[in-house]
C-alpha cells in the first residue's frame, strides 16, 4: 500500500513537475528589466527563451521572435537545449510511468517489469529534472554577468549632455517557476526510484534444509532468489535488484495589466 | 469612433477647487489610459499624470500630485480631475486625451477652460 | 525630466515648399527591447486639441496625409512636410512618451509666408 501510495505521488509530483518544465520553457518572462533604481519608462521590457516582449502603459504589448539561430548567444541555445532535454525525458518518463503504476493492470506484466518500469521513469525524471534546473541556472547566471557588466557602464560614459540609460534585465518568472518545476521533477523522480524497491517481488525466504541423498548432498540456503510469480512453470533465477536509494548532489532550489507607482 | 466630451468652462475663485469632467464614448472606456493635459499661453503643453479606470490606479507627475487629483466612474465611462487649491497660475485649458500605440495621444476632449479669479 | 527642444519656435514658408522642422531630447527616447523611438508629433490648430500625427517617431497615423513623414532616432527628431498646403498652418509639437513624466517640446509656429 505504501508502495503505491509513495508511486503514485511520485507520479503525480513529477506530472506537476514537468507541467511546470513546459509552463517555464514557453514563458516569456525570463528576463524582465529591471525598474529599481531606474528612471521609470513607460515601457515594459521582458525576455523569453524565444522571442522578446515590450509592454508599453499604453497596454499595447508587442512581441517579437528570435528569427535567427546563428545570431544568438550560445548560451541561450545551450538553456533551449538543456529544457528541451528535460521535457523529452520527462515526457518519456510519464509515459513509461504510468505504465508502470501499481493500480494499472496491462495484461500478465509482471511486478518485476513493473519495479524496472518504475525505475526507469525515476531516472528520466531525476534526469529531467536536472536539465531544468540547470538551464534555469545557466540563464540566471548569464542574467547576474550582463546585470552588473551593464550596470558599470551605465556610470561611465555619462559626460555629455544626453544621458542613454541602458536597459538592465533582472530575474523573471519563469526562472522561479522553472526552479520550482525542476525541484518537482527532481523528487518525484526519488520518489519513483524509492517506490521501485519495494515493487520488486518480495523474495520467498526458506529454512536451510539439509537433504541427503544417496549419491552426494545438496544444501539449500535461503534467499538469493526471487519467487517466481507467474503463470506456469518459470525456471528461470531472477536476479535480486538492490533498489537502495542513490545519493544525489543535493541542488537548492531558490524561490497586470499595469504597473503602477 | 472613440469620443470624448468634456465638461464646459468654469470660473473659480482663487483657493477654491474645481472638478471637471470627461465623458467617454465608442471604446471601452476600462480598457485604456486616460490622461490629462494642461495647456497655458506662457507653459504650453504639460502632462498632469493619467488613470487606468479598469482599477482605478494613477500615475502622476510629479509637479501635479497634491495639486490634482484623478478619478473615474466606469458606470458612466467618465473620468474627473478635480484642481485644488486655485490659483492664478492654475488658469489653463485642460484636455483628457486617451492613449495608443507608442504611448502617444489619439483622441483628445475639446478641453475646459478654467479661469482663476481673485 | 526629459527636456524637449524645439527648433525653430516660428517658421514662415510657402505652400508647395518643403518644410523640417526639429525636435532634440536631453534623454535617449530609443528602448533597446524593440528598437523604438517613443517620440509623438502632434499638430494643433487654434481653438482645437492637439491631432496625432506621428507616433514612434516615423509611424504614421492613419488618415494623416502621405506629405506628413517623422526621421530620427535617440536624442534627435525631424518632422518634414514635403509640400507644404495651407491647411498645414499650426503649431506642431513633439512629444517624449518614454520616460515619466511624458513632456512637450514648446513648439513651432508654421506660417504662411
Known amino acids: 500500500m505504501a508502495v503505491t501510495a509513495c508511486q503514485g505521488l511520485g507520479f503525480v509530483v513529477s506530472l506537476i513537475g514537468i507541467a511546470g518544465i513546459i509552463a517555464a520553457t514557453c514563458m516569456d518572462q525570463w528576463s524582465t528589466q529591471d525598474l529599481y533604481n531606474n528612471p521609470v519608462t513607460a515601457v515594459f521590457n521582458y525576455q523569453g527563451l524565444w522571442r522578446s516582449c515590450v509592454r508599453e502603459s499604453s497596454g499595447f504589448t508587442e512581441c517579437r521572435g528570435y528569427f535567427t539561430l546563428l545570431g544568438l548567444p550560445a548560451m541561450l541555445q545551450a538553456v533551449r537545449a538543456l529544457m528541451i532535454v528535460g521535457i523529452v525525458l520527462g515526457a518519456i518518463g510519464l509515459l513509461v510511468s504510468i505504465f508502470a503504476l501499481k493500480c494499472i493492470r496491462i495484461g500478465s506484466m509482471e511486478d518485476s517489469a513493473k519495479a524496472n518500469m518504475t525505475l526507469t521513469s525515476g531516472i528520466m525524471f531525476i534526469v529531467s529534472g536536472l536539465c531544468a534546473i540547470a538551464g534555469v541556472s545557466v540563464f540566471a547566471n548569464m542574467l547576474v554577468t550582463n546585470f552588473w557588466m551593464s550596470t558599470a557602464n551605465m556610470y561611465t560614459g555619462m559626460g555629455g549632455m544626453v544621458q542613454t540609460v541602458q536597459t538592465r534585465y533582472t530575474f523573471g518568472a519563469a526562472l522561479f517557476v522553472g526552479w520550482v518545476a525542476g525541484g518537482l521533477t527532481l523528487i518525484g523522480g526519488v520518489m519513483m526510484c524509492i517506490a521501485c524497491r519495494g515493487l520488486a517481488p518480495e523474495e520467498t525466504n526458506y529454512k536451510a534444509v539439509s537433504y541427503h541423498a544417496s549419491g552426494h548432498s545438496v544444501a539449500y540456503k535461503p534467499g538469493g532468489f526471487k519467487a517466481s510469480t507467474g503463470f506456469g512453470s518459470n525456471t528461470k533465477n531472477k536476479k535480486i535488484y538492490d533498489g537502495g536509494a542513490r545519493t544525489e548532489d543535493e541542488v537548492q532550489s531558490y524561490p497586470s495589466k499595469h504597473d503602477y507607482v | 469612433q472613440a469620443y470624448l466630451q468634456q465638461s464646459g468652462a468654469e470660473l473659480v475663485r482663487s483657493g477654491a477647487s474645481v472638478k471637471m469632467s470627461c465623458r467617454a464614448s465608442g471604446y471601452t472606456f476600462t480598457s485604456h489610459n486616460m490622461h490629462w493635459v494642461k495647456q497655458t499661453p506662457g507653459q504650453g503643453l504639460e502632462w498632469i499624470g493619467y488613470i487606468y479606470p479598469g482599477n482605478g490606479g494613477t500615475y502622476y507627475n510629479q509637479k501635479f500630485k497634491g495639486k490634482a487629483t484623478l478619478t473615474a466612474d466606469t458606470s458612466s465611462s467618465t473620468a474627473y480631475m478635480q484642481i485644488s487649491s486655485l490659483t492664478s497660475e492654475d488658469s489653463a485649458v485642460y484636455f483628457c486625451?486617451?492613449?495608443?500605440?507608442?504611448?502617444?495621444?489619439?483622441?483628445w476632449g475639446q478641453g475646459t477652460l478654467v479661469t482663476v479669479s481673485a | 525630466d526629459v527636456v524637449m527642444t524645439q527648433s525653430p519656435s516660428s517658421l514662415t514658408e510657402k505652400t508647395g515648399e518643403k518644410v523640417s522642422m526639429s525636435c532634440k531630447s536631453s534623454q535617449s527616447l530609443l528602448n533597446s527591447g524593440n528598437q523604438k523611438n517613443y517620440l509623438t508629433w502632434y499638430q494643433q490648430k487654434p481653438g482645437q486639441p492637439p491631432k496625432l500625427l506621428i507616433y514612434w517617431a516615423s509611424t504614421r497615423e492613419s488618415g494623416v496625409p502621405d506629405r506628413f513623414t517623422g526621421s530620427g532616432s535617440g536624442t534627435d527628431f525631424t518632422l518634414t512636410i514635403s509640400s507644404l498646403q495651407t491647411e498645414d498652418l499650426a503649431v506642431y509639437y513633439c512629444q517624449n512618451n518614454y520616460r515619466y513624466p511624458f513632456t512637450f517640446g514648446a513648439g513651432t509656429k508654421l506660417e504662411l509666408k
Open positions: 486625451a486617451r492613449d495608443y500605440y507608442g504611448n502617444s495621444f489619439v483622441y
